[in-house]
């Protein structure tokens, strides 16, 4: 699985997309890494 | 509104510094990464490195490791970009960018500075 | 480093016209690339994310395709404001990396 920032940033996007963005207000791209995928 | 507003023009001499500014507005600035890239003058996009404002973790690319420096100053909301021993070759425009989710999920690119190396 | 490898490098084309432009990558990239364009004197402008996904705001003529190694962006009906120089980018392996651009011009 790609770990670079902008992997993270996209997949981080489509979970928020999934989730309607009801997520924790930290779960921005740059307080995860890809293990939070 | 997102934006992305770079430092001005800079003419350099050979084995000088250039420090470059990336002020962001309209997001929240350590929540997204700051990506840089360079075009020398016709020739393809050339990325130097990206920075965490969050924990001001870098990442370079090789070619440019020991003279390229990614900061960022936190309460300001602005990223920058030193490059040193500059050459002829390090004329190019310098863009910093970055893809934001919230409040609008695009890839957004600062105006571009223009960085010129000449005895 | 990844070689992304563009073709063609210019192409001239009429408004209306088909364009499709394909990028290659030397090794495999999964769907993380993305596609870009540039016109004179102006910043780069993302069109397409993840190989094929349209960034919003962009118009459905841009479409993207591909994995792996071999991608495509295709402009379905080229408009006039479409004359300019696109860019494919891999983000899968540091250092990310750009193709050499493909100019589209007018005919």
């Known amino acids: 699985s790609c770990n670079t920032a902008t992997c993270v940033t996209h997949r981080l996007a489509g979970l928020l997309s999934r989730s309607g963005g009801v997520v924790k207000d930290n779960f921005v791209p740059t307080n995860v890494g890809s293990e939070a995928f | 509104e997102v934006q992305l507003v770079q430092s001005g023009a800079e003419v350099k001499k050979p084995g000088a510094s250039v420090k470059v500014s990336c002020k962001a507005s309209g997001y929240t600035f350590t929540d997204y990464y700051m990506n840089w890239v360079r075009q020398a003058p016709g020739q393809r996009l050339e990325w130097i490195g990206d920075?965490?404002?969050?924990?001001?973790?870098?990442n370079y690319n090789q070619k440019f490791k020991g003279r390229a420096t990614l900061t960022v100053d936190k309460s300001a909301s602005t990223a920058y970009m030193e490059l040193s021993s500059l050459r002829s070759e390090d004329t190019a425009v310098y863009y910093c960018?970055?893809?934001?989710?919230?409040?609008?999920?695009?890839?957004?690119w600062g105006q571009g500075t223009t960085v010129t190396v000449s005895s | 480093d990844i070689q992304m490898t563009q073709s063609p490098s210019s192409l001239s084309a009429s408004v209306g016209d088909r364009v499709t432009i394909t990028c290659k990558a030397s090794?495999?990239?999964?769907?993380?690339v993305a596609w870009f364009q540039q016109k004179p004197g102006k910043s780069p402008k993302a069109l397409i994310y993840?190989?094929?996904y349209r960034y919003s705001g962009v118009p459905s003529r841009f479409s993207g395709s591909g994995s792996g190694t071999d991608f495509t962006l295709t402009i379905s009906s080229l408009q006039p404001e479409d004359f300019a120089t696109y860019y494919c980018?891999?983000?899968?392996?540091?250092?990310?990396?750009f193709g050499g651009g493909t100019k589209v011009e007018i005919k």
């Open positions: 960018a970055s893809i934001i989710i919230v409040p609008n999920y695009f890839d957004y």
């Open positions: 090794q495999n990239v999964d769907t993380n």
């Open positions: 980018q891999q983000y899968n392996n540091y250092p990310y990396t």
């Open positions: 993840s190989a094929s």
């Open positions: 920075i965490n404002p969050n924990n001001v973790g870098t």
